[in-house]
Interface confidence: low
């Protein structure tokens, strides 16, 4: 692996500053496969080609990330560049067969995310679970997941159920949960950060 990532980076580094900006705007609205989330716009707009490549791969994995990048390039009228990207990607082995969707995976980041580090404490101490669910619904949680968490009788069991979904989340999804925690129970986050 790595060939698709390099091909994405090559393509993005060959865009002009204006084209890169246009790429980002189009990326915000390109139709996504079921199960994949959108890269938050605020973070996206400030990224250079290298950061954006890493973000695309962490959000969508190499194969789908390359496909998505090619789709956006084609939508921008850069058919030749899109074709080169796809050609470079398909030269490598290990590309998933068409139609097979790998689920979003965790971004490759050093160490554990705050959410994972403090899993036990969060299960025990979060009280405003409904607020978290509303903040995550439609971005990280599906309707079924949302309802499943709400159906649990106590806050700890709600949080335990919520954590049962986090293995499929990438780093940014976990950041969303952390941000929601900061907004709803900032004192708890501050306490855990000090510990």
């Amino acid at each position: 692996m790595g060939r698709a990532r390099d091909a994405i980076l090559d393509a993005l580094e060959n865009l002009t500053a204006e084209e890169l900006k246009k790429f980002k705007l189009k990326l915000l609205s390109v139709p996504l496969r079921e199960g994949y989330g959108r890269i938050p716009r605020g973070a996206l707009l400030s990224m250079d080609a290298l950061d954006l490549t890493d973000k695309l791969v962490s959000f969508y994995l190499e194969t789908y990330g390359a496909e998505l990048t090619a789709n956006v390039l084609r939508d921008m009228g850069l058919q030749e560049m899109a074709g080169q990207l796809q050609a470079a990607t398909h030269q490598g082995s290990g590309a998933a067969p068409a139609g097979i969707q790998a689920p979003p995976q965790s971004a490759a980041k050093p160490g554990l995310h705050f959410i994972d580090q403090h899993r036990a404490a969060l299960i025990a101490r979060v009280t405003n679970v409904e607020w978290l669910l509303d903040a995550l619904y439609g971005k990280v949680l599906t309707d079924e997941q949302y309802q499943a968490v709400r159906a649990e009788p106590t806050n700890p069991s709600k949080m335990r159920k919520l954590f049962s979904f986090t293995p499929a989340w990438n780093w940014t999804c976990k950041d969303l949960l952390l941000q929601a925690l900061r907004e709803s129970q900032s004192y708890l986050v501050e306490d855990l950060e000090r510990s």
Epitope: S29, P40, G42, A43, L45, G138, K139, D175, L176
Partner: antibody
Framework: QVQLQQSGAELVRPGTSVKLSCKAS????????MHWVKQRPGQGLEWIGG????????KYNQKFKAKATLTADTSSSTAYMQLSSLTSEDSAIFYC????????????????WGTGTTVTVSS | DIVLTQSPATLSVTPGDSVSLSCRAS??????LHWYQQKSHESPRLLIK???QSISGIPSRFSGSGSGTDYTLSINSVETEDFGMYFC?????????FGGGTKLEIK
């Protein structure tokens, strides 16, 4: 208090242009996109386009690309929309509306709306 | 462009009734659906974001639900101040589009 104050009603001739303004107050102007929405009498809402005041990057609804030009002046925290080659079809209320663009979550909805400017195109 | 179809076009209710307003999208919009209220001669006001998330300052009688292509705004025990137009808006794809609106009127 967050407010979007729009310019007054306009009565204009067909074929001419008009420039509408939207003055923002109560928040950091460059932290939010500003969008424009059209509403014809008794009808629904149509998104015209939006501008990021921090760098004047614009995104238009293809339908309005030849009709509207969006600009922003950060020194006065004011967004503008110029409408050209006006016809009776352009008679409508035009709203500016802000859209949050935080660094953590993309907020693709309009949380504050302007007072609206009525444009009447008539000879 | 994604087309949003709202129904019914007009809903006549008595204060105290509970109502549901529908918004159907021409393709899946993955919960990127928001609701606005517009009273006569006023600007629209955001009611619900992302299908079901509440907005500060909006009464709790307003709630939203749905997924895929079908979305609903519910008003539990309508009050006289609730009468007016209601619009849905999708932000899944450019261009942003709005529904044609549902007029909530007094019976």
């Amino acid at each position: 208090q967050v407010q979007l104050q729009q310019s007054g009603a306009e009565l204009v001739r067909p074929g001419t242009s008009v420039k509408l303004s939207c003055k923002a107050s109560g928040y950091t102007f460059t932290s939010y996109w500003m969008h424009w929405v059209k509403q014809r009498p008794g009808q629904g809402l149509e998104w015209i386009g939006g501008i990021d005041p921090s760098d004047s990057y614009t995104k238009y609804n293809q339908k309005f690309k030849a009709k509207a030009t969006l600009t922003a002046d950060t020194s006065s925290s004011t967004a503008y929309m110029q409408l050209s080659s006006l016809t009776s079809e352009d008679s409508a209320i035009f709203y500016c509306a802000r859209e949050e663009a935080s660094t953590v979550v993309a907020h693709w909805y309009f949380d504050v709306w302007g007072t609206g400017t009525t444009v009447t195109v008539s000879s | 462009d994604i087309v949003l179809t709202q129904s019914p076009a007009t809903l006549s209710v008595t204060p105290g009734d509970s109502v549901s307003l529908s918004c159907r999208a021409s393709q899946s919009i993955s919960n990127n659906l928001h609701w606005y209220q517009q009273k006569s001669h006023e600007s629209p006001r955001l009611l619900i974001k992302y299908t079901s998330q509440s907005i500060s300052g909006i009464p709790s009688r307003f709630s939203g639900s749905g997924s895929g292509t079908d979305y609903t705004l519910s008003i539990n025990s309508v009050e006289t101040e609730d009468f007016g137009m209601y619009f849905c808006q999708q932000s899944n794809n450019w261009p942003y589009t709005f529904g044609g609106g549902t007029k909530l009127e007094i019976k």
